[in-house]
């Protein structure tokens, strides 16, 4: 094939090689960019910056090599549009540093940075960690900091991510209250901080105030939906990112729902209880306290992480006619109590029949008198109470 005269030439089915000296100063308008999986760039002294816009449209890119060029700066968000990037070779350029944010979110199997005049600082603590943990093929490169010795020997005692402390109210929070949260940020080289409130939805009206190092957040007119929802404070510096999540407990009274008994590997009387703090539960059977045992007991389903409501069953493993009757679930917390009742019939009473019913016989009896007495079976009648904490 004739040699390719262009700055960048196709290489394989989805690759591009740009090796003609000094032909590029940016990566805009590369031919066939949207299908590229491999991009190889060499000897481009004028290519000094790599930014977000340079790699827009290269969504399929897996391997990026920029070597023996003039690269001085790679923007923290440069690879935002190349989430599939797995090999990145930036060796023999003019890079003094590379932000942790640049590689965040990528699953890099290989990162090559040898031959750059790296400057040892806390901003490269993440790279030192990669070297320590054997990630991305970094240890094999024996990276050096320009005039400072091996990256591995860089002192890192003071290289920490920000420290966060979120203050939440000590007192009980009621529905309709306003709640002030404060996030105190400490650390060197603080860059950015903020709140993540994605879980809150309609749980409160949100007002943010203040900035580094003290961020305020007012949650106005809170609802009970705020329970179990994360409110997250975050902060970043050149070493990395820190997040702290808190939850605000909004008190509200107990509530309870009962549903018709269902046969589900033996029997289940389904219930739902809600309340903050979590209510204690008590069952009554025909108005008397139900003593829970291994054959009649409360069983909860796995709770959803972001809600206070608990679902469960009163499990009846072998109910017979003696278990037929009225089941009441009592739920109580310091803010109120609730109850719900349901009739359950598991089995007909084999000892009960109506004297009016005809008795099927094969001959005429002399006497058709019949008696109907109490059932023979008696449950243990010792009145034990049972309390089950929910939550």
């Amino acid at each position: 094939a004739a040699p390719c005269p262009d700055a960048c030439c196709p290489h394989g089915s989805s690759g591009l090689r740009c090796t003609r000296d000094g032909a590029l100063d940016s990566l805009h308008h590369l031919p066939g960019a949207e299908n590229l999986t491999e991009l190889y760039i060499e000897n481009q002294q004028h290519l000094q910056h790599l930014e977000l816009r340079d790699l827009r449209g290269l969504g399929e890119l897996r391997n990026l090599t920029i070597v023996k060029s003039g690269l001085r700066f790679v923007a923290p968000d440069a690879f935002h549009f190349t989430p599939r990037l797995s090999r990145l070779n930036l060796s023999f350029n003019a890079l003094e540093s590379l932000s942790w944010k640049t590689v965040q979110g990528l699953s890099l199997q290989e990162l090559v940075l040898s031959g750059n005049p790296l400057h040892c600082s806390c901003a490269l603590r993440w790279l030192q960690r990669w070297e320590e943990e054997g990630l991305g093929g970094v240890p094999e490169q024996k990276l050096q900091c320009h005039g400072q010795g091996p990256l591995a020997h860089m002192p890192n005692a003071s290289c920490g991510v920000p420290t966060l402390k979120v203050q939440v109210p000590n007192a009980s929070v009621d529905v309709g209250d306003d709640v002030l949260l404060r996030c105190q940020v400490e650390g060197r080289g603080l860059e950015q901080a903020g709140w993540i409130l994605t879980e809150l939805e309609q749980s409160a009206t949100v007002m943010k105030s203040g900035g580094l190092p003290s961020l305020g957040l007012t949650l106005a007119n809170v609802t009970s939906d705020l329970n179990r929802k994360n409110v997250t404070c975050w902060a970043e510096n050149d070493v990395g990112r820190a997040e702290v999540s808190v939850q605000v407990n909004v008190s509200f009274p107990a509530s309870v729902q009962l549903h018709t008994a269902v046969e589900m590997h033996h029997w289940c009387i389904p219930f739902s209880v809600d309340g903050q703090p979590a209510p204690s539960l008590r069952w009554l059977f025909n108005g008397s306290v139900l003593n829970e045992t291994s054959f009649i007991f409360t069983e909860f389903l796995e709770p959803a992480a972001n809600e206070t409501v608990r679902h469960g069953c009163l499990r009846l493993n072998q109910p017979t006619h003696v278990n037929n009757g009225n089941y009441t679930l009592l739920a109580a917390n310091p803010f109120g109590q609730a109850s719900a009742s349901i009739m359950a019939a598991f089995m007909d009473n084999p000892f009960e029949f109506n004297p009016e019913d005809p008795i099927p016989v094969s001959f005429s009896p002399v006497d058709t008198n019949s008696t109907s007495g109490d059932p023979v079976e008696k449950k243990d009648e010792t009145p034990f109470g049972v309390s089950v904490a929910v939550g």
Epitope: H265, S294, F295, F297, N317, Q318, T320, E377, A389
Partner: antibody, heavy 117, light 106 residues
């Protein structure tokens, strides 16, 4: 697979106490009731009591109510049965067994407790 | 408490014969459960909920009954069926066991 592994044999003097452990593995400990059953030499099975690790609920056989104590440590998935004021007729093999929806589906290997002066 | 009485105390039969073990309750129970125990071993759940065979139990075993009278039947005895069989109720506290039936194979 489900395993209930009990502590080793014990020899005790009358009036002493014994604490038998039952370490569970292979299932969610808190979802099952744990029963304790004993069997004197050449005799039948006698139920001591049951405990629900999920909430600590305990039911005892009235016969053992004042002498037996059932406890659990959910952090190590272990149930315990302590029997106090031992008498010679407490000499027996003590078993733990688990149940959820069906009775005593798996048993420990048993712990021999000998009470002798 | 519900007292369970098993009969006979000992049953001695030859291989291939049919064995019938009975368990009578002092008051009505919803279901009966059976355990097999061999010397030096822990009991094993054998039949539960009156008639369900536990995992690994041969089909020659069956269970039946209701109210106060329950039966474990072995249709055709095999030598490995020699053991003590206990019935148990799980309907009221305290849980109780029968005194056991020793099945011997001649």
């Amino acid at each position: 697979q489900v395993q209930l592994v009990q502590s080793g044999a014990e020899v005790k003097k009358p009036g002493a106490s014994v604490k038998v452990s039952c370490k569970s593995s292979g299932y969610t400990f808190t979802n099952y009731w744990m029963h304790w059953v004993r069997q004197a030499p050449g005799q039948g099975l006698e139920w001591i009591g049951e405990i629900y690790p999920n909430n600590g609920r305990v039911n005892y056989n009235e016969k053992f109510k004042n002498r037996a104590t059932l406890t659990v440590d959910i952090s190590i998935s272990t149930a315990y049965m302590e029997l106090s004021r031992l008498r010679s007729d407490d000499t027996a093999v003590y078993y733990c067994a688990r149940s959820r929806y069906d009775p005593m589906e798996d048993w420990g290997q048993g712990t021999t407790v000998t009470v002798s002066s | 408490e519900v007292v369970l009485t098993q009969s006979p105390a000992t049953l001695s039969l030859s291989p291939g014969e049919r064995a019938t073990l009975s368990c009578s309750a002092s008051s009505s129970v919803g279901y009966m459960h059976w355990y097999q125990q061999k010397p030096g071993q822990a009991p094993r759940r054998w039949i539960y909920d009156t008639s369900k065979l536990a995992s690994g139990v041969p089909a020659r075993f069956s269970g039946s009954g209701s109210g106060t009278d329950y039966t474990l039947t072995i249709s055709s005895l095999e030598p490995e069926d020699a053991a003590v069989y206990f019935c148990q109720q799980w309907s009221s506290i305290p849980l109780t066991f029968g005194q056991g039936t020793r099945l011997e194979i001649k």
